[in-house]
Interface confidence: low
């Protein structure tokens, strides 16, 4: 539909509250360093302008595109050049180049202070004093730290954040009520951000076709009773929603996501039997619920795939006539039969099938050539199955912390050039796959584990892209989206790496480590472990374990000492000397 005023159209569709929240998210995701007050001012100006357009769609500038309106507003920020450097050059460009320029300057790892949680009473006072500002600040802080966070989903998080404070600030024990809820929101928020980052990377780095293939596979697993045409319609609409959000078109994205949820709920009967509860919820909860809904039961009478995709004499004719539709059908049919496979595995199988048809349909006897194509799938299926089995056994043997340490060592040896904070963050997240997925029965392990690993390895890829230091990482990240995990798994110790010079300062610790939370203390120890491996990449597991055990004992001893700082200074020197000797540094 063509609207005289796009800004009026979106304001009316979304309502003032959601409009303002989404504009704030959009601005904070673009200008990540701007103070909160500056963003609120810009949002209020845009909102007032939108209201004039609602009153009269023919008013001056109301016919301008949202990118033009928002870009013009962002470019009024006085300190743009001082704060953002070359991003200010975006403002010299015209749309659509200006928006593309802003998108390219989004920073996945902005130099912002860690969010420190104030005391519960302080938070409750701030919440009661000015609820609106308190919630806006939440949106602003999350959006600027996560510039690709899925905006309509962030509205859902904000709604839960508000509900937590509304309930808990009246409770007898405010902290006991509030803190677990905030921890849950924080952890879910990080996971949600990382999942969306993969969707945006998929669209931006590998194109719409790659995203659509992912969506066909995932939706076919989730809605195995839906017809192919129905799944294809959902994929087309979902692709539009995510393309918009990843492109900074947050108002359109939120509006289209609401339309998609409405369509799904109106057509439940031809999509899935699992949607009933979701569809009874209010809009934000409904959309979230649909996105997380469990897989429907597979139809009982599905025929063998071989008939249509191997045995039929028309395979090449069908393939040649409409390649992507035929491959889409293959992926749909395979995925709906295999909720036990990861999406990336299904995409590897589809790619193998496509490659086989490309080769065989040009051969003298195509049918003879592709007759055994399903046999080629066996090793592709077994590889992740075996890897997950081995790693779940290791996880069950070691527990999460030591399993993370094993992965830290493994990945530091593979790509030692990567920065230590990135290696720690990524390896810790890789290690969480154990507690997240190994508890599941076999039929659910692979989709849980391998699709989660895809999300985590994408974090490595986007962080590495900002400051590329390793050709091996670049290669695994850019060659094939679906083969990233096998590519990293296949990396051996980097024999070309020149060990880091030993620096005693890296291994100097102070009494402040004693007041850290258990998680922060683990991160300190894991940082030291990465540095150790960078100094001595050929160190054995046993050597590293011995040094880490000594280190843990040293921290425990000094944290119990009366004069902690002296203990850390004196015992620390001894520990460094002993570690150097043990590792032959």
């Amino acid at each position: 539909d063509a609207h005289k005023s796009e800004v009026a159209h979106r304001f009316k569709d979304l309502g003032e509250e959601n409009f303002k929240a989404l504009v704030l998210i959009a601005f904070a995701q673009y200008l990540q360093q701007c103070p909160f007050e500056d963003h609120v001012k810009l949002v209020n100006e845009v909102t007032e302008f939108a209201k004039t357009c609602v009153a009269d769609e023919s008013a001056e500038n109301c016919d301008k595109s949202l990118h033009t309106l928002f870009g013009d507003k962002l470019c009024t920020v006085a300190t743009l050049r001082e704060t953002y450097g070359e991003m200010a050059d975006c403002c010299a460009k015209q749309e659509p180049e200006r928006n593309e320029c802003f998108l390219q300057h989004k920073d996945d790892n902005p130099n912002l202070p860690r969010l420190v949680r104030p005391e519960v009473d302080v938070m409750c006072t701030a919440f009661h004093d000015n609820e609106e500002t308190f919630l806006k600040k939440y949106l602003y802080e999350i959006a600027r730290r996560h510039p690709y966070f899925y905006a309509p989903e962030l509205l859902f998080f904000a709604k839960r954040y508000k509900a937590a404070f509304t309930e808990c600030c009246q409770a007898a024990d405010k902290a006991a009520c509030l803190l677990p809820k905030l921890d849950e929101l924080r952890d879910e928020g990080k996971a949600s951000s990382a999942k969306q980052r993969l969707k945006c990377a998929s669209l931006q780095k590998f194109g719409e076709r790659a995203f659509k293939a992912w969506a066909v596979a995932r939706l076919s697993q989730r809605f195995p009773k839906a017809e192919f045409a129905e799944v294809s319609k959902l994929v087309t609409d979902l692709t539009k929603v995510h393309t918009e959000c990843c492109h900074g078109d947050l108002l359109e994205c939120a509006d289209d996501r609401a339309d998609l949820a409405k369509y799904i709920c109106e057509n439940q009967d031809s999509i899935s039997s699992k949607l009933k509860e979701c569809c009874e919820k209010p809009l934000l909860e409904k959309s979230h619920c649909i996105a997380e809904v469990e897989n429907d039961e597979m139809p009982a009478d599905l025929p063998s795939l071989a008939a249509d995709f191997v045995e039929s004499k028309d395979v090449c004719k069908n393939y040649a006539e409409a390649k992507d539709v035929f491959l889409g059908m293959f992926l749909y049919e395979y995925a709906r039969r295999h909720p036990d496979y990861s999406v990336v595995l299904l995409l590897r199988l589809a790619k193998t099938y496509e490659t086989t048809l490309e080769k065989c349909c040009a051969a003298a006897d195509p049918h003879e050539c592709y007759a055994k194509v399903f046999d080629e799938f066996k090793p592709l299926v077994e590889e992740p199955q075996n890897l997950i089995k081995q790693n779940c056994e290791l996880f069950e043997q070691l527990g999460e912390y030591k399993f993370q340490n094993a992965l830290l060592v493994r990945y530091t040896k593979k790509v030692p050039q990567v920065s230590t904070p990135t290696l720690v963050e990524v390896s810790r997240n890789l290690g969480k796959v154990g507690s997240k997925c190994c508890k599941h029965p076999e039929a659910k392990r692979m989709p849980c584990a391998e699709d989660y690993l895809s999300v985590v390895l994408n974090q490595l890829c986007v962080l590495h892209e900002k400051t590329p230091v390793s050709d091996r990482v670049t290669k695994c990240c850019t060659e094939s989206l679906v083969n990233r995990r096998p590519c990293f798994s296949a990396l051996e110790v980097d024999e070309t790496y020149v060990p880091k010079e030993f620096n005693a300062e890296t291994f100097t610790f102070h009494a402040d480590i004693c007041t850290l939370s258990e998680k922060e203390r683990q991160i300190k120890k894991q940082t030291a472990l990465v540095e150790l491996v960078k100094h001595k990449p050929k160190a054995t597991k046993e050597q590293l374990k011995a040094v880490m055990d000594d280190f843990a004992a040293f921290v425990e001893k000094c944290c119990k000492a009366d004069d902690k700082e002296t203990c850390f200074a004196e015992e620390g020197k001894k520990l460094v000397a002993a570690s150097q000797a043990a590792l032959g540094l």
């Epitope: 294809s232 319609k233 539709v325």
Partner: nanobody, 115 residues
């Protein structure tokens, strides 16, 4: 709700013409290749003709080449099959499908060629 509704069938004498239409709804018609398939009494489905999503690439079964023409109007979300020089062996139920699938169960339209 995804729907494909065929129309335009009927009784025609050998050598005569018919134009079949297939109105699509509930999915992004312009994104998909489409086909016409027919099923004669007591026989399995037989692929007749296909057209790509943009309408540029068309394909025909040997049995209808030179007599049938497939076309589409993406704005109207409609697929067509112009059938000329009809023969008694063209008698069948004709139905349209997405891509080259014969799995989607639409009602079809009956074409009978008889003197």
């Amino acid at each position: 709700q995804v729907q494909l509704v065929e129309s335009g069938g009927g009784l025609v004498q050998p050598g005569g013409s018919l134009r079949l239409s297939c109105a699509a709804s509930g999915f992004t018609f312009g994104s998909f290749g489409m086909s016409w398939v027919r099923q004669a009494p007591g026989k399995g489905p037989e692929w007749v003709s296909a057209i790509d999503s943009g309408g540029a690439d068309t394909r025909y079964a040997e049995t209808v080449k030179g007599r049938f023409t497939i076309s589409r109007d993406n704005l109207k979300k409609t697929l067509y099959l112009q059938m000329n020089s009809l023969k008694p062996e063209d008698t069948a139920v004709y139905y349209c499908t997405i891509g080259r699938s014969t799995s989607r169960g639409s009602q079809g339209t009956q074409v009978t060629v008889s003197s």
